[in-house]
């Protein structure tokens, strides 16, 4: 079999959904030593970058600047260290937003609950669209879809106290273009008395994985990683 | 608003040699990463060659060896320099820009690309 190098870490910086006209960054995490790096784009290559130096630098940042909805869909990396390529990273799906309309969303019976109350949000828009799509603010990974014409309800069914927090949904016009996002609906959940001062509330940190994470190797981490080795060949 | 003019082109005979010129107004050209595609008749458009803002370049497997590009800032033009032409070279070349860039991609995708020009006719014929 041919031999392959590990496969690299693709990732949107800030976020994987861009406003449309606005700039997309992705990260490419390879190896330090990588001469080359491959941006994909729907199996087809988009870009490409050449680290200098490259053994001081782990990865790239790819640029896509005025997004479109030409630009969105599955993106996918690969680097190269001498002749020998990576495996493919796995596939990153970057969104246009800001597309057409703006939904309203809603939430019945509304938005001040008790906890194991069965909560509903619904998201309307007029214009012609089948898919919809809820999101909770810091979970923007953890997308609902669901159907209909001109609106969609998701139900949520009994709510805890994770439940709690913003809310807003978009209608979509493919997997990849999406509408403008409603205005937020804060979710309050609240609980029993013993419980709800025990209940964490709900963090809306930035996902973690929209973040590049690359790092320039210095002389200092280079002369660190070779006194490293050196204790540990006086230590056998 | 970014316009992009091409010249250059013309008939030549096979093992010939021509150089396109692509003339870019506006104030952002430094700050673009350029692109030359072709499209022969009745084919899709085709990537050429790239270079990045920074100079860094990228060539089709085609053409690698035998087509080169550059850019001069100061003149605000990107240069295609053609050389051992081939009958299968024969298509309208385009030059294309990515504004604005940041660091030092090379774009090889059309979709890539958000301003082009007009383009200018290359026959390779005996």
């Known amino acids: 079999p041919k031999q392959t190098l590990p496969k690299p870490i693709i990732r949107a910086e800030s976020t994987y959904m861009v406003p449309k006209e606005k700039q997309a960054t992705l990260c490419c995490q390879g190896s330090y030593g990588a001469v080359e790096y491959q941006l994909h784009f729907e199996g087809s290559l988009f870009a490409v970058e050449r680290p200098k130096p490259p053994e001081r630098i782990n990865g790239v940042k790819f640029h896509i600047p005025d997004m479109n909805s030409r630009k969105a869909g599955r993106y996918s990396c690969i680097y190269r260290v001498g002749e020998l390529w990576s495996e493919r990273s796995d596939l990153l799906d970057l969104v246009v937003t800001e597309m057409y309309d703006t939904p309203t969303l809603s939430v019945h019976p509304g938005p001040e609950v008790t906890s194991g109350e069965k909560v509903t949000f619904y998201c309307r828009l007029d214009t012609a669209t089948s898919m919809f799509l809820l999101l909770k603010e810091g979970r923007s990974r953890d997308v609902q879809r669901s159907y209909g014409k001109v609106q969609a309800e998701f139900p949520m069914g009994p709510v805890t106290t994770a439940h709690r927090g913003s809310y807003r949904c978009f209608g979509s016009y493919n997997n990849y273009a999406w509408s403008f996002p409603s205005e937020p609906v804060k979710l309050l959940v609240t609980g029993d008395i013993e419980n709800t001062s025990l209940a964490p509330t709900d963090p809306t940190f930035p996902d973690s994985w929209d973040t590049c994470l690359l790092t320039r190797e210095t002389g200092l981490q280079k002369d660190l990683a070779l006194w490293d080795h050196t204790a540990q060949n006086l230590l056998r | 608003e970014v316009q992009l003019v091409e010249s250059g082109g013309g008939e030549v005979q096979p093992g010939g040699s021509l150089r396109l010129s692509c003339a870019a107004s506006g104030r952002t050209f430094a700050s673009a990463a350029m692109g030359w595609f072709r499209q022969a008749p009745g084919k899709e458009r085709e990537f050429v060659a790239a270079i990045s803002r920074s100079d860094d370049t990228y060539y089709a497997e085609s053409v690698k060896g035998r087509f080169t590009i550059s850019r001069d800032n100061a003149k605000n033009t990107v240069y295609l320099q053609m050389s051992s032409l081939r009958a299968e070279d024969t298509a309208v070349y385009y030059c294309?820009?990515?504004?604005?860039?940041?660091?030092?991609?090379?774009?090889?995708?059309?979709?890539?690309?958000?301003?082009w020009g007009q383009g200018t006719l290359v026959t390779v014929k005996p």
């Open positions: 294309a820009a990515v504004v604005p860039t940041y660091g030092s991609n090379i774009y090889v995708h059309s979709a890539a690309y958000n301003y």
